[in-house]
Interface confidence: low
């Protein structure tokens, strides 16, 4: 808490420039206006403020702002807004994707802070659903956010937000996680021709459900061991085969080379030998 | 044995409200997406609404949308349909079906609730 | 809005015959048709989903096939409990939607 004084003569800021690096903290609060404060706080990222100083521009704002800060103000946090705490953001209604882009680059290149992630919750939330623009931005500034979702907050992404999502952006998702984004995937590619649906459903199928494995066993896809191995198990298993062979095409032979992982190990075991003899890979079951 | 339960259908008249509950046994209703379909007196059937696991996604039929709102409490493993500004042509068996493996087709179906609008 | 149009509308038929319905989508939906059979006053009991693929429990007398716009459901050998309206329906794409019916009588 910065203690009141009287500000010195000559001293009130009639403006918010670089002259008041010069100022002491007590200066700072005295002499500053906080509603100055707030119609110019696009300035301060300009002047190189100490940390000390910024404490107490925060500590004016927050006296002029109980409630929570205006949008027209948290825009222009800039450096600011590394001195904001959860419970500050959380008073927050942050509707602009551009405040919401200005707050990240602030941010840019540190791991997920608190403060961040009570941002951007904040954001979503006020939008009621994660849509396309906001999924561009966040995992263009953090790949791993989707996957940092719980499967009940990935309920509301919308499909036509999958287009944004690259497969580097599933890398950490889990099958529960898959399990909600598949079928929000297979209807935003549903209108795709046979090839191209396949190379942007491949990094959801660790969500789909055996019957959609079956159907893709007709399409001539020669899927990859890697995107097999990420299957679910319990959908895997009632494949047969012949739709296994059809499925991998050519890569069909490198089941020999994961016969002792999942899913692949589970599911020789379900298969007859004889059915399991026509790969000519000798596969035991 | 998967069980779905339909109720709440009856008579009402034109402009006003019915809420129909469909409540399932033998599953783990959370983890399954959930559907209502009708089907009117001697015609086929037709889709009316549809709802994810968590509940977060609704989907709806365009002769529905804006009158009825589906949702769900997986707490007590209970699907719901609210129909307001009801009209005649709504009158019809409801019925509430639960997704298959697939995501748009139900492998298990209640017995029904009949909804009648007329004045 | 995908339209599914089924043929016949109706049908008559005896026990032992090989039974073709067949099911045309507005649009290709790939292979995401289900078939249901409806009784007279029960409620729809589900046949085949991804276009050729049993649901449990179902005879295998019942076979479904086809992609894109065109799917086929086969009863090899009719029997008597087999007598009822069957449904084709596409999950390609929100709305979902089912063809008219075919009512499968006996001559």
């Known amino acids: 808490e910065v203690e009141k004084t009287a500000c010195p003569s000559g001293k009130k800021a009639r403006e918010i420039d670089e002259s008041l690096i010069f100022y002491k903290k007590w200066e700072l609060e005295a002499c500053v206006d906080a509603a100055l404060l707030a119609t110019q706080m696009d300035r301060v990222n300009a002047i190189p403020f100490t940390y000390e100083q910024l404490d107490v521009l925060k500590h004016k704002l927050d006296e002029l702002y109980p409630q929570g800060y205006p949008e027209s103000v948290i825009q222009h946090l800039g450096y600011l807004f590394l001195k904001m705490s959860p419970e500050d953001i959380r008073k927050w209604n942050v509707t602009s994707l551009e405040t919401l882009k200005a707050l990240l680059e602030v941010n840019k290149g540190h791991e997920m802070s608190p403060q961040v992630a009570t941002l951007i919750d904040r954001f979503v939330k006020g939008r009621g659903q994660l849509d396309k623009d906001t999924l561009d931005t966040l995992t263009a500034f953090y790949p791993g956010y989707l996957c940092s979702l719980s499967p009940e907050e990935l309920s509301s992404v919308p499909p036509s937000s999958i287009w944004a999502v690259r497969p580097q952006d599933l890398d950490t998702c889990d099958p529960r996680q898959l399990d909600v984004l598949y079928p929000k995937a297979r209807l935003a590619f549903q209108n795709m021709n046979g090839s191209e649906y396949f190379v942007k459903i491949q990094s959801f199928l660790g969500g789909a459900p055996t019957e959609d494995l079956k159907a893709l066993s007709q399409q001539n896809v020669s899927m990859d061991l890697a995107t097999f191995m990420k299957l679910r198990t319990d959908a895997v298993l009632p494949l047969t085969v012949a739709e296994v062979q059809k499925l991998l095409g050519p890569h069909v032979e490198g089941l020999k080379a994961e016969e002792r992982h999942r899913p692949v190990r589970d599911w020789i075991l379900r298969q007859r030998q004889d059915d399991l003899d026509t790969l000519g890979l000798g596969l035991q079951g | 044995e998967v069980q779905l339960l339909e109720s709440g259908g009856g008579l009402v008249q034109p402009g006003g409200s019915l809420r129909l509950s469909c409540a399932a046994s033998?599953?783990?209703?959370?983890?399954?997406?959930m559907t209502w379909v009708r089907q009117a007196p001697g015609k086929g059937l037709e889709w009316v609404s549809g709802?994810?696991?968590?509940?977060?996604?609704?989907y709806y039929a365009d002769t529905v949308k804006g009158r009825f709102t589906i949702s769900r409490d997986n707490s007590k493993n209970t699907l719901y349909l609210q129909m307001n500004s009801l009209r005649a042509e709504d009158t019809a068996v409801y019925y509430c079906?639960?997704?298959?493996?697939?995501?748009?087709?139900?492998?298990?179906w209640g017995q029904g609730t009949l909804v009648t609008v007329s004045s | 809005d995908i339209q599914m149009t089924q043929s016949p509308s109706s049908l008559s038929a005896s026990v032992g015959d090989r039974v073709t319905i067949t099911c045309r989508s507005s649009?290709?939906?790939?292979?995401?048709l289900a078939w249901y059979q409806q009784k007279p006053e029960k409620a729809p009991q589900s046949l085949i989903y991804?276009?050729?693929s049993l649901q449990s429990g179902v005879p295998s007398r019942f076979s479904g096939s086809g992609s894109g716009t065109d799917f086929t459901l086969t009863i090899s050998n009719l029997q008597p409990e087999d007598f009822a309206t069957y449904y084709c329906?596409?999950?390609?794409?929100?709305?979902?939607?089912f063809g008219g019916g075919t009512k499968v009588e006996i001559k």
């Open positions: 033998g599953l783990t209703f959370r983890s399954y997406a």
């Open positions: 991804a276009a050729s």
């Open positions: 079906a639960k997704r298959g493996a697939a995501v748009g087709s139900f492998d298990y």
């Open positions: 649009q290709g939906i790939g292979s995401w």
């Open positions: 329906q596409q999950y390609n794409s929100y709305p979902l939607t």
């Open positions: 709802i994810s696991v968590s509940g977060g996604i609704t």
